[in-house]
Structure formats: C-alpha cells, structure tokens
C-alpha cells in the first residue's frame, strides 16, 4: 500500500472557511465564489517516537499547492507559518519533522491542532475574522481552537 | 558556537557498564535529535542509537537493543550512553552526533570529540 | 541487516575529480535511505557533508555533491584541493535505523 494524504474541508464553530490571501491562510466567512482551500493531511509514519495520548501526529499541507503549515519562534513567539514543501517528503523523512507537524485531537466533531515542536500551542483564528491563522497558548478566550474538519473521499 | 563536548576515556572490565556523557552547547537539544555512533579500532563507523531529547523517546539498532540506554537530562543539555555486559569487542571510541532537520533535509552535522572505552580484564 | 560497503582507499590529483561511492547489500540505494556523508580530518571533529542524497549541509563548499549512481549513493569531489585529504564515511537509512559504511580514505597526491 502506497501512503498517500487524506484530503479534508475545515471551518470553525462560528462556520469560518480557510482561504489563501498573499501566503498567508485567513479564515473568513463562506460565500458564494469563495474558493476555501482543501486540506492535504498525513500521520507522521514514525508515531511511535513522539508523545502518546496528546492526539494523532499529523502533517498539515494545501491540497495541491506544495503548501504545508509550520511553526517557528520569531524573536520568542511560536508563529504559525506556510512554508513551500511537499508533504510526502516530510513523511518520508527518517525522523519526524516537528516543526510541521501537529497532534490532532478530536472531541466528538472538534478538532485541535497542538505543535510538536511548541508543546500548549494551538492552531487558533481570532474570534473577529478576517484573520490570519494563529498559534496560540490561550484556550477559549480571544482566539478559537476547535475546528470542524470534514475529510473528503 | 555549536559544540558537542563528551565524558573522558573509560577502562572497564568485562561485564561492567560504562555511561558516557555528550554535553550540548550553541544550540538547543530539544530542537534536534542526538545519536550514538562508535567506531572500534581499524573498522568503520557503527551505528547504536538515538534520543529525541524534547521528549525520551528513543531507538536503537537491533544488535544493541537491551545493552544500550540512551537518556536525556535537559536541565544540563546533556545525552547519556550506558552499555552494559561489556566484552572486549565493545572497545571503541564512541562518538555523539546532532541529527539536524536544516531546509529540506537531516544531516548529520555536527560530532562530539569521541569518548574511548577500553573493555579489558 | 544491511551492510554498506564503500571504497578502502582512493587517490586524487590536486583540481582532480573522484567519485566515491556507498553500496547496500540489500539493492539498490534509492533517495528512501536518505544518504549523508560525513567528513573526518585528522586532528578535527567530524563534520556533515551531504544530507538526504544530494543535499549540502550549510558552510560545506560547493565542491563536493551527492547523487544517486547506478544503485549506489556517490559523493562527488570537483576540484580537489589538499585540505580534501580525509575519511569519508557515508550513512544509510533503512526504515528505522541507520547503517555506516566502513569510510573511504581519500588522499590528494
């Protein structure tokens, strides 16, 4: 069996899509003539290595951009950033790659997405919208967490 | 600067157990993987293990699965090696290096001096 | 387990260029076993040339490159200078662990 990415849709609780704008992932309300990107997304082949209990360990990319998020201290702040990669190369690697890569937990129909490589931190978008994407310590407060995500077959 | 700095040479007995120091500096640890190599007199480089400092998770190659014990103290920045039930073909030096993901790959960047383990009755 | 073989000795002319080469006793060497090559000079530290078959690691002059030849990993030096004088030992990646060859050791003469 050949390993390929799962593909999925995501939008928050307050029914806000993710769309591309100048490299940078925003999450804004769906309307018509909207083109929300597909999430490409995969299981760090090397699970065994990484912490048990806190989710699935996966690679987040965009459907067929060669797009995937990851996460970076700028000065001391954890960002969320898109790099230009392939994420079947990041899957291939002999070792995880954490700072692409993001435990996925699942609570009934939420999803979170914590950093690997920033432990606490969490894919967020700000209550306003018309935001960029975020990582955040902060759960439930200025920023949303939880994310429908709907895979694609 | 990065630098990988180890624990002095060793002379054991057959049986015994020696535990190795790597101490990382310049960087840190829990941002990369460190790894376990040794090189025995006149041969090539054998690979024993690896740590993910950030958090303990470890692999080892099969023929050391059980006499070696890779652990982390990330209050000092510093990899441990314990090989236990030494014989005399486990004389080496034994080397530590960083496994660093750098733009699109792992490299195998930078080496610890190498620590000596004499294994002899 | 796989054994990977390299070259005992090689000699190259100043400005020359040599191939040296890293070969699995399980087939062909493909970009799944992430070749590195790693460089001892006597009196120094070891020092990573290559990732990922053909990836130069930062600082490393662009002299030196690695590529896939005839099912082997291959790490190429173009214009050798006296300094090049080392053992160079490549490492395999075989789906969970890693296997070095026995170091090729590259005079320049």
């Known amino acids: 069996k050949i390993d390929t990415p799962q593909r999925g849709s995501i939008q928050d609780i307050n029914h806000r899509v993710w769309v591309l704008q100048d490299q940078t992932l925003i999450a804004v309300p769906r309307k018509d003539r909207m083109s929300p990107v597909t999430i490409a997304l995969i299981s760090c082949r090397h699970v065994e290595t990484l912490e048990k209990d806190r989710g699935n360990p996966i690679y987040l990319g965009l459907n067929g951009l060669n797009l995937c998020l990851m996460c970076a201290k700028v000065g001391d702040q954890p960002t969320l950033q898109l790099k230009e990669k392939d994420i079947m190369d990041l899957y291939n690697q002999p070792e995880p790659v954490k700072s692409f890569l993001f435990y996925h937990s699942q609570s009934g129909r939420n999803s979170t997405f914590e950093s690997v490589a920033f432990p606490g931190w969490f894919i967020a978008v700000s209550s306003e919208g018309g935001c960029p994407l975020i990582l955040t310590q902060e759960l439930g407060k200025a920023n949303t967490t939880d994310f429908g995500l709907t895979m694609l077959f | 600067q990065v630098q990988l700095v180890q624990s002095g040479a060793e002379v054991k007995k057959p049986g015994a157990s020696v535990k190795v120091s790597c101490k990382a500096s310049g960087f840190n640890i829990k941002d990369t993987y460190i790894h376990w190599v040794r090189q025995a007199p006149g041969q090539g480089l054998e690979w024993i293990g690896r740590?993910?400092?950030?958090?303990?998770?470890?692999r080892y190659d099969p023929k050391f699965q059980g006499r070696a014990t890779i652990t982390t103290d990330t209050s000092t920045s510093t990899v441990y090696l314990e090989f236990s039930s030494l014989r005399s073909e486990d004389t080496a030096v034994y080397y530590c290096a960083r496994l660093h993901y750098f733009g699109n790959n792992f490299f195998f960047d930078y080496w610890g001096q190498g620590t000596l383990v004499t294994v002899s009755s | 387990q796989a054994v990977v073989t390299q070259e005992p000795s090689l000699t190259v002319s100043p400005g020359g260029t040599v191939t040296l080469t890293c070969r699995s006793s399980?087939?062909?060497?493909?970009?799944?076993?992430?070749a590195n090559w790693v460089q001892e000079k006597p009196g120094q530290l070891f020092a990573g040339l290559i990732g990922?078959?053909?990836d130069r690691a930062p600082g490393v002059p662009a002299r030196f490159s690695g590529s896939l030849l005839g099912g082997k990993a291959a790490l190429t030096l173009s214009g050798a200078q006296p300094e090049d004088e080392a053992i160079y030992f490549c490492?395999?990646?075989?789906?969970?662990?890693?296997?070095f060859g026995g170091g090729t050791k590259l005079t320049v003469l």
């Open positions: 990922g078959t053909n």
């Open positions: 399980s087939g062909a060497v493909t970009t799944s076993n992430y």
């Open positions: 490492a395999l990646w075989f789906s969970n662990h890693w296997v």
């Open positions: 740590i993910d400092p950030a958090i303990g998770t470890t």
